[in-house]
């Protein structure tokens, strides 16, 4: 599955092709780069498009419903999420009942949490309707743990 | 190391206008939210809204909504606060402070700027 | 809106004794609650935030606990330094909400 990763300097995607890729964290433009040894918090989000149908082309990532859809999704994630400590979105996965989007957030550990991550979400749901064209309900979030994430970071800067 | 810097002291009459700037440093300017809190004298902090330098994007605290405009200016890394139509009410300090995300925490502020607002 | 209510709005305590601020939230927001100081004539400085991590160069005598709707900071041993207001803010809804403060004082 491809992944998106937040551009530092630019608005524009990358793409890889491993599974679970982050971007590497000394690549950030910022003054105060994170050293190799910053953690990463994941996230898993899921939630519905309501008014959109799930077909076959959505098990096929070469057709363009696929291809249009994920890039709907990542562009509205680069937006909400813009941008101190976002890293980016993998595994983006289209499941049946309306459609059901499942994807990964990487964040720059220690600068939000859970709820934060859905609240931010939930506030833009009116404007990806009306940018993207997407009515967004059901969305849920929960922690990912993961091996290589030290633990709750007293060393990342606001 | 991050640094915030606003500009200084302003007295204004009720009805004109004032443009606070807030100057940065040591960090990606365009990539973090900048916000905009005020402190009444002896009072508490209000939020009063942010700005994404990267595209402009503002979100504004409904109660400010009308009588301040934020903006910035990427080539010299400085974010301002117009508020117009001053009333004695506006009198205040004014905070920037740098955040992640939309709704996030503030680890970076300004100094602050007093703004008075007085016949 | 999302009301953050502090308590006590004033504490006087004695170098060295332990005190306890609470802030409450009119809704649940899980733990998006951070904590900031503020001296007189300074800027707020961030203390604890997502209502109980740590901040680099924050004294360990601070500390932060709670989730849901009540949340509180605690000075476990007090120094003259530390007299200032004191600020709860979410972060789960928007408007970004603070407390009203509670102002610390040394006997």
């Known amino acids: 599955t491809p992944t998106t990763l937040a551009s530092h300097s630019t608005k524009t995607d990358a793409s890889s092709t491993h599974h679970s890729s982050v971007p590497p964290l000394t690549s950030s433009n910022h003054s105060t780069s994170p050293q190799l040894s910053t953690g990463v918090s994941f996230f898993f989000l899921s939630f519905h498009i309501s008014n959109l149908q799930f077909n076959s082309s959505l098990e096929d990532p070469s057709t363009d419903y696929y291809q249009e859809l994920q890039r709907d999704i990542s562009e509205m994630f680069l937006q909400i999420y813009k941008q101190g400590g976002f890293l980016g979105l993998s595994n983006i996965k289209f499941r049946p009942g309306s459609v059901v989007v499942q994807l990964t957030l990487a964040f720059r550990e220690g600068t939000i949490n859970v709820h934060d991550v859905e609240t931010q979400f939930n506030q833009y749901k009116t404007e990806a309707a009306s940018r993207y064209n997407l009515t967004i309900s059901d969305v849920s979030v929960s922690d990912v743990p993961f091996p290589f994430s030290a633990q709750s970071g007293a060393g990342v800067p606001g | 190391q991050v640094q915030l810097v606003q500009s200084g002291a302003e007295v204004k009459k009720p009805g004109s206008s004032v443009k606070i700037s807030c100057k940065t440093s040591?960090?990606?300017?365009?990539?973090?939210?900048m916000n905009w809190v005020r402190q009444a004298p002896g009072q508490g902090l209000e939020w009063i809204g942010q700005?994404?330098?990267?595209?402009?994007?503002?979100n504004y605290n409904a109660k400010f909504k009308g009588r301040v405009t934020l903006t910035a200016d990427k080539s010299t890394s400085t974010a301002y606060m117009e508020l117009s139509s001053l009333r004695s009410e506006a009198t205040a300090v004014y905070f920037c402070a740098r955040s992640y995300y939309r709704s996030a925490w503030f680890a970076y502020w300004g100094q602050g700027t007093l703004v008075t607002v007085s016949s | 809106e999302i009301l953050l209510t502090q308590s006590p709005d004033f504490q006087s305590v004695t170098p060295k004794e332990k005190v306890t601020f609470t802030c409450r939230a009119s809704q649940s927001i899980g733990t998006s609650i951070h904590w900031y100081q503020q001296k007189p004539n300074q800027s707020p400085k961030l203390l604890i935030k997502?209502?109980?991590e740590s901040i680099s160069g924050v004294p360990s005598r601070f500390s932060g606990s709670g989730s849901g709707t009540d949340f509180t900071l605690s000075i476990n041993s007090v120094e003259s330094e530390d007299i200032a207001d004191y600020y709860c803010?979410?972060?789960?809804?928007?408007?970004?909400?603070f407390g009203q403060g509670t102002k610390l004082e040394i006997k």
């Open positions: 040591g960090y990606a300017f365009s990539n973090f939210w």
């Open positions: 803010q979410q972060s789960n809804n928007w408007p970004l909400t």
């Open positions: 997502y209502a109980s």
């Open positions: 700005i994404y330098p990267g595209d402009g994007d503002t």
